[in-house]
């Protein structure tokens, strides 16, 4: 699957912590992006930023940051983004990606529940035979 | 923010040539290789061409390769496709493309991107 638009860090400039390395086939590997003048690999800093494959990204991109409602499954490292869940009793919908949505408590009547609230998707009813 | 502008798609018969641009408002294109992807209904996208934008290095899929031609212009802030010969089955909405996503370094063919254009829809008639 492709990977879709992110947010670059707002690092204009390697920190003198940064470990630089030089880039193989003018490509920098997953935790690190490239330098201006496509000379070095610069890496990441651990969560603040990353990226995920070989790249000639001139900023890595972005940490996730939970939002308040989601619980936070896996922190962000220098190869990884943040893996963000829906907290209990809420899920994310795939058209809503942005924002978690309550639960229904329970089917309305004539319905019978066949499937239990996830973090991404709500309780299932189906019709009574 | 990065912000790929695509335009130049449009409406050609078999045999024609098309001109498609890509600029790059915000922090330019936040990469070095930008590059072109093609995605037509019920597929997944595909790479089509890919520049570096330091040394003019280009990358080409082998079903264009001879016919389309990727350029740029560092100073304008814009990447071109020349597509020639086009064909019906060149038909396909095109994405310009910039953070290109690689398996490995060695590899030719990215799996994907950061940064996408809106789009623009290039049609070949027979």
């Known amino acids: 699957a492709l990977i879709t638009q992110q947010d670059l860090a707002p690092q204009q400039r390697a920190a003198p912590q940064q470990k630089r390395s030089s880039p193989s086939e003018g490509l920098c590997p997953p935790g690190h992006h490239i330098s201006e003048d496509g000379r070095d690999c610069i890496s990441c800093k651990y969560g603040q930023d990353y990226s995920t494959h070989w790249n000639d990204l001139l900023f890595c991109l972005r940490c996730t940051r939970c939002d308040s409602g989601e619980v936070e499954l896996s922190p962000c490292t220098t190869t990884r983004n943040t893996v963000c869940q829906c907290e209990e009793g809420t899920f994310r919908e795939e058209d809503s990606p942005e924002m978690c949505r309550k639960c229904r408590t329970g089917c309305p009547r004539g319905m019978v529940k066949v499937g239990d609230c996830t973090p991404w998707s709500d309780i299932e009813c189906v019709h009574k035979e | 923010e990065v912000q790929l502008v695509e335009s130049g798609g449009g409406s050609v018969q078999a045999g024609d040539s098309l001109r498609l641009s890509c600029a790059a408002s915000?922090?330019?294109?936040?990469?070095?290789?930008v590059g072109w992807f093609r995605q037509t209904p019920g597929k997944e996208r595909e790479f089509v061409a890919a520049?570096?934008?330091?040394?003019?290095?280009?990358y080409y899929a082998d079903s264009v390769k001879g016919r389309f031609t990727i350029s740029r212009d560092n100073a304008k802030n814009t990447v071109y496709m020349q597509m020639a010969s086009l064909k019906p089955e060149d038909t396909a909405v095109y994405y310009c493309?910039?953070?290109?996503?690689?398996?490995?370094?060695?590899?030719?063919?990215?799996?994907?991107?950061?940064?996408w254009g809106q789009g623009t829809q290039v049609t070949v008639s027979s």
């Open positions: 493309a910039a953070g290109l996503q690689y398996n490995r370094s060695a590899d030719r063919v990215p799996v994907g991107a950061v940064y």
């Open positions: 915000g922090r330019t294109f936040g990469s070095i290789r």
């Open positions: 520049i570096n934008r330091n040394d003019g290095t280009t």
